[in-house]
Interface confidence: low
């Protein structure tokens, strides 16, 4: 005896409630092989996982693990998270342009270096793609009797703790 369900292709299931008619998999489910009596529920990319490939009627969703991010509008592939000195764009990780920096791993955007002269200060340490400039003391701070000045810590985006 030929099992009538063997004729049902991937993307369908053999519907026992409808005399073994091949019915399309319902939304959020799939069957990757023919002859299936049920469609499997699509994987949901939760927590540290992000959708790498959307679920289709014939294949399960694929997820990016922590440390990787989706690339492309349909998350067609996973790319390693951006390093300090980079920012994530639609085209992937891009190096911070001259005069900007990002000191965070995996998140954040490239921000302009601090303009020391706006505070009447000099540049003590030059900025890099990964670090903001360090502003030195102003001439007034160097007058006799002034205490030594600790350079300010680089500014951070609100909500981000130190790495």
């Amino acid at each position: 005896l030929q099992d009538p369900c063997s004729n049902c292709p991937a993307g369908t299931f053999c519907d026992n409630n409808r005399n073994q008619i091949c019915s399309p998999c319902p939304p959020n489910s799939f069957s990757s092989a023919g002859g299936q009596r049920t469609c499997d529920i699509c994987r949901q990319c939760k927590g540290v996982f992000r959708t790498r490939k959307e679920c289709s009627s014939t294949s399960n969703a694929e997820c990016c693990i922590e440390g990787f991010h989706c690339l492309g509008p349909q998350c067609t592939r996973c790319e390693k998270d951006c390093r300090p000195g980079q920012e994530l764009t639609k085209q992937g990780c891009k190096t911070c342009s001259l005069g900007t920096f990002n000191d965070q791993n995996g998140t954040g955007v490239c921000r302009p270096w601090t303009n020391c002269s706006l505070d009447g200060k000099s540049v003590l340490v030059n900025g890099t793609k990964e670090r903001d400039v360090v502003c030195g003391p102003s001439p007034a701070d160097l007058s006799p009797g002034a205490s030594s000045v600790t350079p300010p810590a680089p500014a951070r985006e609100p909500g981000h703790s130190p790495q």
Partner: antibody, heavy 117, light 107 residues
Framework: QVQLQESGPGLVKPSETLSITCTVS????????VHWVRQPPGKGLEGLGV???????NYNSALMSRLTISKDNSKSQVSLKMSSLTAADTAMYYC???????????WGQGTTVTVSS | DIQMTQSPSSLSASLGDRVTISCSAS??????LNWYQQKPDGTVKLLIY???TLHSGVPSRFSGSGSGTDFTLTISSLQPEDVATYYC?????????FGGGTKLEIK
Amino acid sequence: QVQLQESGPGLVKPSETLSITCTVSGSSLTSYGVHWVRQPPGKGLEGLGVIWPGGSTNYNSALMSRLTISKDNSKSQVSLKMSSLTAADTAMYYCARVTGTWYFDVWGQGTTVTVSS
Amino acid sequence: DIQMTQSPSSLSASLGDRVTISCSASQGISNYLNWYQQKPDGTVKLLIYYTSTLHSGVPSRFSGSGSGTDFTLTISSLQPEDVATYYCQQYSKLPWTFGGGTKLEIK
């Protein structure tokens, strides 16, 4: 020759979590499903749940809240975890291979689990 | 869930006898029924799938029939090695469920 071998703790205390492993040889977990079945002493077979080649699972509705079935294709191992054990979970636990034509063609020898303090 | 009921729960027959075991489903399952044999040592083997298809290596004295809700496993001539408990199992709808078993002994 396809073989399935269950391994478990034997004795588990009430309220603890049971963990059993089914090791499959001679067959790929990416091509076949694995179903867990148990048999309390002197009683019949009870299906617990199945894990499909793609990794998705279906569970016995009465036990769903306590069951987790997972697998490691590279190790050819399927694991069953059952939480909040009671004496009623004392049984022989079997794993069986599920074919594409929906029958259990190869069974393990079973592993005895006793829930007792 | 679909309930599977087997009868009798146990039976005793003589060598060479024709033995029949019944299995009833709580709702129609078409031909989606398998039969398994569990030996006294606990070993479980597939006998018949899709109601009537004999699994490879199973002696031809075993046969299956039925459709819808009522199914039968028949042993045409009972042999000593047939002493076992027999289970039906439906796979029409998940979760797949087993009958309560029929224990077969030799008189």
